[in-house]
């Protein structure tokens, strides 16, 4: 069975940011700004035609 | 620091796991200058199919 889509789990540290409780709440400005920057960044990295998008962004303390 | 975890989706056959990681790692310097994000400890793995099917089901 093939979906025609490949999924990859990716994790990384952002060492110059501090985790706080607002990153547990998707309605906060801090959460939304970071999510927007990361989404934009991945669109830049994987510019080639095969990239479909990202999902399930989670932030945790490092 | 902040740990970011996410799932990336690509059209099947267009990229292997090595290039997902390599392309991300090669962008780290630009990420620091453009987004002020200092990225380290990158880890990439393929998601087993049952999980991908569920995540695609929304």
């Amino acid at each position: 069975l093939s979906t025609g889509v490949s999924f990859f789990f990716l994790s990384f540290h952002i060492s110059n940011l501090q985790f706080n409780s607002s990153l547990e709440d998707p309605s906060t400005d801090y959460y939304q700004e970071l999510q927007r920057d990361i989404s934009e960044m991945f669109l830049q990295i994987y510019k080639q035609g095969g990239f479909l998008g990202l999902s399930n962004i989670k932030f945790r303390p490092g | 620091s902040v740990v970011v975890q996410l799932t990336l989706a690509f059209r099947e056959g267009t990229i292997n796991v090595h290039d997902v990681e390599t392309q991300f790692n090669q962008y780290k310097t630009e990420a620091a200058s453009r987004y002020n994000l200092t990225i380290s400890d990158v880890s990439v793995s393929d998601v087993p199919f049952p999980f991908s099917a569920q995540s695609g089901a929304g």
């Epitope: 490949s6 080639q48 035609g49 095969g50 | 099947e12 056959g13 267009t14 990229i15 292997n16 796991v17 090595h18 390599t22 090669q26 393929d46």
Partner: antibody, heavy 120, light 107 residues
């Protein structure tokens, strides 16, 4: 047409170094990754590593990390592989091979191979 | 590292026979599987990529199949010019390991 032409056979003494070249023609050198593969006499193929000539990014098979260095000269459209501290087990034919372009996960063109013989 | 186990290591068959070579990966390589043909004293030549796509100029008697960890290369009707050693290769993750090869001979 695409061609990868490698340098000639070499005979070296144990402990010496050797630099093998791979001259590319018929395509834009900087837009394709170049890989190197080892084939010991009568044996199978062993992937050593690659260089992206556009960015000079290299990735090595851990087994060859301290044995080989991959470089590229954009102006000469030539990739190089240097082998250090040669031992008898380094005796082999070494191939350069071009990886296809975007989303092309295969070696579409190979050099003719360079035989490196290590003998005292 | 992903190990590629190729079988058989050698094979003798008659002209016109159907021949199948198999390759098993130690992990899922998601169809990033390549087959090469190497004739004595020559460089390897690309036959099949993405597990089943035949490269231009390769006769249609060659076909690739499989998924996940199990892959095969089939020659539907063996010809004398098919005498060679065949290698599979993992192109999913580094190191891009090869199988140990299958030496194909004519009976």
């Amino acid at each position: 047409q695409v061609q990868l032409v490698q340098s000639g056979a070499e005979v070296k003494k144990p402990g010496a170094s050797v630099k093998v070249s791979c001259k590319a023609s018929g395509y834009t050198f900087t837009t394709y990754t170049m890989h190197w593969i080892k084939q010991a006499p009568g044996q199978g193929l062993e992937w050593m590593g690659y260089i992206n000539p556009g960015s000079d990014y290299t990735h090595y098979n851990q087994k060859f990390k301290d044995k080989a260095t991959l470089t590229a000269d954009k102006s000469a459209s030539t990739a190089y592989m240097e082998l250090y501290s040669l031992r008898s087990e380094d005796t082999a034919v070494y191939y350069c091979a071009r990886q296809g372009n975007y989303a092309a996960y295969y070696f579409d063109y190979w050099g003719q191979g360079t035989l490196v013989t290590v003998s005292s | 590292d992903i190990q590629m186990t190729q079988s058989p290591s050698s094979l003798s068959a008659s002209v016109g026979d159907r021949v199948t070579i198999t390759c098993r990966a130690s992990g899922n390589i998601h169809n990033f599987l390549v087959w090469y043909q190497q004739k004595p004293g020559k460089s390897p030549k690309l036959l099949v990529y993405n597990a089943k796509t035949l490269t231009d100029g390769v006769p249609s008697r060659f076909s690739g199949s499989g998924s996940g960890t199990q892959y095969s290369l089939t020659i539907s009707s063996l010809q004398p010019e098919d005498v060679a050693t065949y290698y599979c290769q993992n192109f999913w993750n580094v190191p891009f390991t090869f199988g140990s090869g299958t030496k194909l001979e004519i009976k």
